[in-house]
């Protein structure tokens, strides 16, 4: 037998050589087109175990979008043409609750994850005899990277877990399935470094199947929280990084997610956008924002992607796209998965599972609405799966997809034989479809959430809504005193009365300044290095939030460090929600916030309003009958018509579908 | 650009009083909290009264109430300090400050965290 080379097996303690042998009757004289379904018998400790595998029909779509730039930076959109793809998802014959994320690509790679261990599967460099390593991935050395927890907790955590019996898996998913009946749809947008690019030899066909893989991986492992990962989409920086990524992980981070609100959700609708960096920063392997998954400022996190398998590393992003679904951090909780360690652990352990604290975190996302993306099923042009019938996903020439036959007799409106709606029907299914028919135009189908946000309307034509929009950036509100951002009008009293109940007021400035002077946990402007920034004077309303009036504690999943700071007569309050370095603290001032005349909050600084970008006269341009919104159009008031309210109308903007039906006036706002 | 000017300053005798203005300009004065600090030879700088930008409550330091006024005309966009029965401890630089009070800043026991300042009017009290 071929002996591995150092370099395939140096990460390994142990590992074994097995010649994995196919049981399927048609013989395939050439690696490509793919089978649809395949088995395999593969030895694993002593045992032969079967092996069922089905190409995952839902990763990828048809028109799988990659962007790329050329040497003078300009953009180039490519769809591959890889819907016959290599990527599986399958079981283990006779082991209940077993899932199989494999490529077949060039020999098996991928994860095989049993009752009671995950094992990796990789084809032996230089083996003529299809030969293969498998270890288990208890046996993969790591760099001890970490979200921000000691490592005495993190030992503490994993001796307590080794004492308790975990319950079985078997136990865990059936209670998780009735914890979240329904399947949420993650559309993930990757977005792949230069220095990852050029480590990957410069080969972006390389850099895109390690993509699909991963993306595979990650479907494995949230299938369990009935959470399917949908790719929509890959960017490499094949030029050069279009953010800076000098600094900590939160500045990266930071960078990062403006970035994609600036460039990449115009060009692409997705649900979370992760970027995959070479660099490292000092023993943190990622970062994400929590619970942010359908926000258009903040759903992305960075990941590190060094001398690591991608193996190891889908449990990094596993992990950080956690967070944007709301999980915390398993540390000090109770939790269990079957494992020693689960993925939400801090100490980015490599675990394939995630605990019954995740699904418990993901399931109050999804309760106090923070998940409402991820209940589209995706559109055609925006699911890359290959188109199939029944898989619930709306491919590519089908009018709809109600899923399996027993799953098709409940559904009015959609043959599910052939993908295509009944004879009678206008739609099947969106927000603007009732009962096979598309509503009425002027039916109002997204309420405004806030005073910096406008209300949408069913258009009468078709079963979406219309897209998302809100009030431009920069555009005062709150009497004034704050501006809208992000939909949002970003002011500290309301800040204080999401975390410490409706009561709740912002401090005095003074706590702000006494407070965010110090430099510590409770009181900074951010992280550089490995300390806490101190605040400038000038800067202290953007760093830690301080509140009064305070009367209830906050639960968010995880109790935090509260303090309070006496000062001058009153009592600051602060928290610190001890959620690792690898989260950005929900105790700190938002983004966007108004901290003095013309100035707001960004990266913890007090800086120009200007970097809004606000340039709407609505004098001028809306004729005082209106503001502008997030595309720069007018949004009238009633009494208004767009695009200018300068003549009489019924409100509304170019954006917002119409306002009014005349076949039914009950129906406007 | 916010600007603020303060006058009326000058030499007075013990019981006498003085009204120091302070003219502001480049921003509404009725959507900012305004005070006025004081600041003796080798003290440190106190608050003497500020009034809120929110609803026009009012504070005065326990040394000066009942003896100062603060008000405002927003029309003008001035603001006033009515000084009656004035004390030779009174004796200060007397600054002028103003705040868009985004989060509270003038309150009891109120520090100088406002944003902008004018460079100050001398009251000495002496006979």
């Known amino acids: 037998a071929a002996r591995p080379g150092f370099q395939q097996t140096s990460h390994l303690s142990s590992y074994e050589i097995i010649t994995p042998w196919r049981l399927t009757r048609e013989r395939r004289e050439a690696p490509r087109p793919y089978s649809k379904q395949v088995s395999y018998v593969i030895q694993a400790e002593g045992k032969e175990h079967i092996i069922h595998l089905e190409r995952n029909k839902d990763l990828l779509p048809e028109d799988f979008v990659v962007y790329t730039y050329n040497k003078e930076g300009t953009l180039i959109t490519d769809h591959p043409n890889i819907q016959n793809h290599c990527h599986y998802r399958g079981y283990v014959e006779g082991v209940h609750n077993s899932s199989i994320a494999l490529s077949d690509c060039f020999g098996l790679r991928g994860l095989l994850h049993l009752e009671n261990a995950s094992y990796g599967i990789e084809p032996l460099q230089n083996s003529s005899h299809f030969e293969h390593i498998i270890y288990r991935m208890d046996d993969v050395y790591k760099e001890p990277l970490k979200c921000g927890v000691s490592n005495k907790d993190i030992e503490k955590e994993t001796a307590k877990d080794e004492e308790e019996e975990p319950p079985s898996m078997t136990q865990l998913l059936r209670r998780r399935r009735a914890v979240l009946p329904q399947t949420r749809y993650v559309e993930l947008f990757i977005v792949v470094d230069k220095e990852r690019y050029d480590m990957m030899g410069r080969n972006q066909t390389a850099v895109r199947e390690e993509m699909i893989l991963l993306a595979n991986y990650l479907d494995s492992m949230y299938i369990m929280l009935n959470i399917r990962i949908v790719l929509v989409g890959l960017e490499i920086w094949t030029n050069g990084n279009l953010i800076n990524i000098v600094g900590g992980a939160g500045d990266v981070l930071g960078n990062f997610v403006q970035w994609r609100e600036k460039f990449l959700i115009t060009r692409r609708r997705h649900d979370s956008a992760q970027l995959v960096l070479k660099k490292g920063f000092g023993g943190t392997a990622g970062m994400a924002f929590v619970g942010t998954v359908c926000s258009r400022s903040h759903a992305g996190g960075i990941n590190v992607f060094g001398q690591i398998t991608v193996e190891t590393f889908a449990s990094i992003v596993a992990h950080e796209l956690g967070h944007n679904l709301g999980m915390n951090h398993d540390d000090g909780r109770d939790c269990s998965c079957g494992a020693k360690s689960c993925i939400m652990n801090s100490g980015a352990s490599g675990s394939r599972n995630f605990s019954s604290c995740s699904a418990e975190d993901f399931e109050k996302l999804t309760l106090n609405k923070g998940g409402n993306c991820l209940l589209n099923i995706p559109k055609p042009d925006e699911a890359y799966s290959a188109p199939s019938c029944g898989n619930k996903l709306v491919d590519a020439g089908e009018e709809c997809d109600c899923g399996t036959p027993k799953e098709c007799e409940l559904d009015p409106c959609c043959e599910g034989s052939t993908c295509k709606l009944k004879s009678f029907a206008e739609c099947a299914y969106g927000d603007c479809c009732k009962d096979c028919r598309f509503l009425p135009g002027g039916t109002l189908c997204r309420g405004k959430t806030s005073e910096c946000d406008v209300p949408e309307y069913c258009n009468g034509s078709s079963q979406f809504c219309q897209p998302d929009v809100f009030i431009q950036n920069g555009y005062p509100c709150q009497n004034n005193k704050a501006y809208c951002y992000n939909g949002m009008c970003q002011y500290y009293d309301a800040q204080c009365q999401v975390i410490f109940g409706s009561k709740a007021k912002a401090a005095p400035k003074d706590c702000f300044i006494e407070v965010n002077s110090k430099g510590d946990r409770f009181g900074n402007c951010g992280f550089s290095g490995n300390e806490y920034k101190k605040c400038a004077t000038g800067n202290a309303l953007c760093g830690k939030l301080q509140c009064e009036n305070v009367q209830e504690i906050p639960v968010f999943g995880i109790v935090p460090a509260i303090i309070q700071t006496p000062s001058r007569g009153t009592k600051c309050w602060g928290v610190d929600f001890q959620l690792g370095s690898d989260v950005p603290d929900p105790g700190m001032v938002n983004e966007g916030t108004k901290c003095g005349a013309g100035k707001i909050c960004r990266n913890f600084q007090c800086v120009d309003a200007s970097v809004l970008n606000y340039d709407c006269d609505v004098q001028k341009k809306c004729h005082g009958h209106g503001v502008c919104n997030s595309n720069k159009n007018c949004h009238c008031e009633n009494g208004w018509a767009p695009p200018n309210c300068e003549t009489k109308g019924y409100g509304g903007s170019v954006d917002s579908g119409p306002t009014y039906n005349e076949m039914n006036t009950a129906l406007r706002d | 650009e916010v600007q603020l000017v303060e006058s009326g300053g000058g030499l007075v005798q013990p019981g006498g009083s003085l009204r120091l203005s302070c003219a502001a300009s480049g921003f509404t004065l009725d959507s900012y909290a305004i005070a006025w600090f004081r600041q003796a030879p080798g003290k440190e700088r106190e608050g003497v009264s500020c009034i809120s930008s929110s609803d026009g409550t009012t504070y005065y330091a326990d040394s000066v109430k009942g003896r100062f006024t603060i008000s405002r005309d927003n029309a003008k966009n001035m603001v006033y300090l009515q000084m009656q029965s004035l004390k030779p401890e009174d004796t200060a630089v007397y600054y002028c400050?103003?705040?868009?009070?985004?989060?509270?800043?003038?309150?009891?026991?109120?520090?100088?965290?406002?944003?902008?300042w004018g460079q100050g009017t001398q009251v000495t009290v002496s006979s």
């Open positions: 400050a103003a705040d868009p009070e985004l989060v509270t800043v003038c309150r009891p026991g109120w520090g100088p965290a406002y944003d902008y």
